[in-house]
């Protein structure tokens, strides 16, 4: 039973402090006077990072974002002054928060602010080549942001810039309550959803916007958008959200009488992400968080995968979908959503639907309509009546990639890299949370690549206190992911191989598709590296079949076998520590009495309790005393990490050792502690201090005490010997260890 | 002023086919839809068939699908109507009318066309 | 397809009276109708489009009203030269159907 459960955590969980210590991340705290750093454009050609946060615009190099430079935009005292009298919060809203941050053309981009509840926009210049290092506002030239970002800061915007227009779905009113879909700039008239129709769009919140071509005519391209809104009532009962993603044919310029200036092509379906339930009732992740879509070789297919979380406050989960563009688009082909019957139910459209099909782009490829302008009244009609798709969008294999139900966080952010291996192409997921941690997980095919598993590599920690992960960008070109929160920005390498381990067993039970041994140590692999020594399988992470022949290998460079010493006393309680760095391997006690060869597997009883940290053994008799050998096994690879011998001290042995008076020889004592380290001294004098405080219950209890002396005795006395200093840093390190999982990279055998 | 003016009509027999035209002028064609609207003797308007601006696509009645065929020459300013399998039901008086993407503004005078044996 | 029914089939007042006609149709098509008028051995001409709306060139004592189902075209004070047939006509789908209109004669 000890094993259920295993796979579901993450192999690696590195703090923020060790991620720190291990030169992982690189973070840009903020500045005092800015916060939301949530509006994020990667520019891989200029090699920046350009995110928008409260009052600034910040360009952060992609090599190191500690190297940045930083527009300041804040709004002036009398719109400030406004907004404060309006009822809003000096602080949280009555800033500039920076909701757009768009690529206009080669020399600038294009940004919008909330403004104080009075959205504004403007240009940034940034010149033509990287070279140049221009960063600069035009502040001659501000634009009205009504329609491109919202009033409130706490809502979002989901935009994209093309072609000089740019698409956005945002609030456009100060009450935040007219939601819509909007095209500006440019030189046609301004374009928007349907106003004040539940039917089009009902209490939304977008997340993002993308351009996919529908076929090789850019007529027929689409601007895809995805959010999640309030279900239409009659659609569920009670109150629940739905996750969408709409469409709207880039040439949509409107009606010629009805919809005029209003998309003619907006259409809606639901994204399901759901799993079946014990009782026939799905479980359905319907808060959509964020999507990324992974391109493909086909610029019309990319796979689109979609952060989803629960609504339920009861039920707490988070869940990764994946959805293919052709099943999307099948969907949009199929019936309309249409209310009718004495319930007034939603039922699928069963009527002529007219021609030109509504939600087919005006083009020579769709019976020449050269303009939405064009369609015949019918279609516009239907069109504005029917924007939903009766057939939802299921997911690829009709269920999640990856579910996680179990623990205090849920997901808000994915991005996600494809990766070439030994044996394949692999999709990597870092996933962004609410605490300020980031999974790294892999889809392994089981039996087909159809069949995916869902390996979580590592769970990392990127910033000091625990916030919401509300942006993230991958940068292929520099192999660096960024992460923005509310307090700042992270940067950290998709890959770190040599954190695994110095063994070849190691780096292959990583499953890392990133990390290959090369014959001397876990490194980066390169699909084009010819070199037979590469040892990677990350479809099953079997150490037994890639490193056998390596065996003897790494034993001679991999880790020295740990060894310690513990006394511990009769009828008194003793803890084993072991804890391997892989929160996958299970850890397998075994017992060699002394003098003997034999060894024997630890039975668990009330003598002898395991737990997440080691053995506790209570109730110490003399037959205890011996060799414990501590092995992690992960998939089938056994590996020992840790002998330690026990030596119990028998009551009488104790009384006659403890009372010995100070001024006598105390031969026994020098004897038994001469052949200590310095280290095992300390631990033998502490557990002579547990035997004689019966009132401290725990080891925990004990060790407080432990460290309040040591304390106690600094402060008194601040000249103490250099000596003694070192027997405390070696203790503490001792017994800090034991809370943590993946310290010291280096200490050889925890490396599992 | 806008002006249409339909030929064509005339005595075919049943089975037979005939072409309509009809001439535009005073406005720009190619922005219209176009539409032929009939109307047998001593009866209401019946609708026949409707093409949009480009050309691309056209709208028929059950009562002609696959017999009429409507198409239209930008460059000339020209609307057609190909008629072929004709019964003696489709004797009327066939008018060339501006519009179809909504109301039918403006028609020509007509042009007769009966079906007899 | 959506059948328009126009009622009553012929109406007789005299001129100076107000002429109220009637077209049904057999499901909503919001205010996707146009009325025509016929004379004999004269091609039809746009009065009224989208239920209400007026066209340039027609008098000002025609109107109309209605959407849905119903709507209703209306003349003010009839003139001699009113006495015609008029027809509606659904623009909301195809295919297109007109009215059997409605003959308004001298009385």
């Known amino acids: 039973n000890y094993a259920n459960g295993k796979n579901n955590v993450p192999r690696l969980k590195l703090s923020y402090k060790e991620m720190l210590e291990s030169n992982n991340v690189i973070t840009f705290n903020g500045l005092a006077n800015s916060s939301s750093y949530h509006t994020f454009l990667l520019d891989e050609e200029r090699s920046r990072l350009y995110v928008g946060a409260k009052d600034h615009i910040f360009s952060f190099n992609l090599v190191n974002i500690k190297d940045f430079q930083k527009i300041v935009w804040p709004v002036s005292y009398t719109r400030r002054d406004e907004c404060k009298w309006a009822g809003k919060d000096i602080l949280k809203e009555c800033a500039n928060f920076i909701k757009v941050l768009e690529a206009y053309n080669q020399t600038h981009l294009y940004a919008c602010g909330t403004g104080a509840f009075h959205p504004i926009c403007t240009y940034i210049e940034v010149g033509h080549h990287p070279e140049d290092n221009i960063f600069k506002l035009q502040d001659s030239h501000f634009e009205n942001g009504r329609g491109k970002s919202p009033y409130d800061p706490k809502l979002l915007t989901a935009s994209l810039l093309i072609d000089g227009e740019l698409y956005s779905g945002t609030a456009a009113d100060f009450m935040g309550r007219d939601f819509a879909i909007f095209r500006t700039l440019g030189h046609h008239h301004p374009i928007r959803t349907e106003q004040h129709d539940s039917r089009w769009l009902n209490d939304p919140r977008f997340i993002s916007a993308h351009l996919i071509p529908e076929s090789d005519n850019p007529e027929d391209d689409k601007v895809y958008f995805f959010f999640r809104e309030n279900a239409i009532d009659g659609e569920h009962s009670g109150k629940a959200t739905h996750a969408r993603i709409g469409q709207i044919c880039k040439n949509d310029f409107g009606g010629h009488r009805s919809l005029v200036n209003k998309w003619t092509t907006f259409l809606k379906a639901r994204l399901i992400c759901s799993v079946p339930g014990p009782n026939g009732i799905d479980t359905h992740f319907d808060e959509l968080q964020d999507v990324f879509l992974m391109n493909s070789k086909d610029p019309k297919n990319p796979i689109v995968y979609g952060v989803f979380t629960t609504s339920s406050n009861i039920f707490k989960g988070s869940a990764v979908c994946m959805y293919s563009m052709s099943d999307v688009r099948r969907v949009f082909l199929g019936p309309y959503a249409h209310r009718d019957g004495p319930n007034y139910q939603w039922v699928p459209y069963q009527g002529r639907v007219p021609y030109p099909r509504p939600g087919t782009c005006p083009s020579k490829t769709f019976g020449g309509f050269d303009s939405t302008k064009d369609l015949p009244d019918d279609v516009i009609t239907f069109a504005r009546s029917h924007p939903a798709m009766y057939n939802p969008v299921f997911p690829i294999n009709n269920r999640p990639i990856m579910i996680k139900t179990d623990v205090n966080y849920q997901f808000t952010q994915i991005v996600v890299d494809r990766v070439d291996a030994e044996d394949g192409q692999y999709d990597v997921m870092f996933i962004g949370t609410d605490v300020g941690t980031v999974l790294k997980v892999v889809s392994v095919p089981k039996e087909t690549w159809h069949d995916l598993e869902e390996i979580l590599l590592e769970e990392m920690t990127v910033f000091r206190e625990p916030t919401t992960i509300s942006a993230m960008e991958l940068s292929t070109k520099q192999q660096q992911l960024y992460i923005g929160s509310t307090a700042g920005v992270a940067q950290l390498p998709l890959h770190r191989c040599d954190i695994y381990g110095k063994a070849c067993a190691e780096c292959c039970l990583a499953r890392d598709p990133y990390c290959a041994w090369d014959g001397s140590s876990c490194s980066r692999y390169f699909p084009t590296a010819k070199r037979r020594t590469r040892r990677q399988d990350i479809r099953n992470g079997d150490p037994l079949t890639h490193c056998s022949d390596l065996q003897h290998h790494d034993n001679h460079h991999g880790p020295s076998l740990e060894e310690r010493i513990i006394y511990g006393v009769e009828n008194s309680s003793t803890f084993l520590e072991c804890s391997p760095k892989s929160q996958r391997a299970l850890v397998y006690w075994q017992f060699q009495r002394r003098n003997e060869d034999r060894k024997e597997e630890i039975r668990m009883g009330d003598h002898i309790i395991r737990t997440e940290q080691g053995l506790l053994l209570r109730s110490l008799q003399k037959k205890d005393s011996g060799n414990y050998l501590c092995h992690a096994v992960e998939h089938g690879f056994m590996q020992t990490l840790l002998k330690v011998t026990l030596e119990v001290i028998d009551t009488e042995h104790l009384e006659e050792l403890l009372h010995k008076d100070d001024d006598g020889d105390g031969s026994k004592i020098k004897e038994m502690s001469s052949s200590m380290t310095p280290s095992q001294k300390v631990w033998y004098r502490d557990f002579m201090q547990l035997i004689n405080h019966p009132n401290l219950n725990t080891m925990d209890e004990f060790c407080e005490q432990v460290w309040k002396r040591d304390r106690k005795q600094r402060r008194q006395r601040p000249g103490h010997s250099q000596g003694s200093s070192n027997k405390w840093k070696h203790m503490q390190e001792s017994k800090k260890g034991r809370n943590r999982r993946t310290h010291e990279f280096e200490r050889a055998p925890r490396s599992v | 002023e806008v002006q249409l003016v339909e030929s064509g009509g005339g005595l075919v027999q049943p089975g037979g086919s005939l072409r309509l035209s009809c001439a535009a002028s005073g406005f720009t064609f190619s922005s219209y839809y176009m539409s032929w609207v009939r109307q047998a003797p001593g009866k209401g308007l019946e609708w026949v068939s409707t093409?949009?601006?480009?050309?691309?696509?056209?709208y028929y009645p059950d009562s002609v699908k696959d017999r009429f065929t409507i198409s239209r020459d930008n460059s000339k300013n020209t609307l057609y109507l190909q008629m072929s399998s004709l019964r003696a039901e489709d004797t009327a008086v066939y008018y060339c009318?501006?519009?179809?993407?909504?109301?039918?503004?403006?028609w020509g005078q007509g042009t007769t066309v009966t079906v007899s044996s | 397809e959506i059948v328009l029914t126009q009622s009553p089939a012929t109406l007789s007042l005299s001129p100076g009276e107000r002429a109220t006609l009637s077209c049904r149709a057999s499901q909503s098509i919001g205010d996707y109708l146009h009325w025509y008028q016929q004379k004999p051995g004269q091609a039809p001409r746009l009065l009224i489009k989208y239920a209400s709306q007026s066209i340039s060139g027609i008098p000002a004592r025609f109107s109309g009203s209605g959407s849905g189902t119903d709507f209703t075209l209306t003349i003010t004070s009839l003139e001699p030269e009113d006495f015609a047939v008029y027809y509606c006509q659904q623009g909301y789908s195809f295919p297109y159907t007109f009215g059997g209109g409605t003959k308004l004669e001298i009385k």
């Open positions: 093409i949009i601006k480009s050309g691309g696509y056209a």
């Open positions: 009318v501006r519009g179809g993407q909504g109301a039918m503004d403006y």
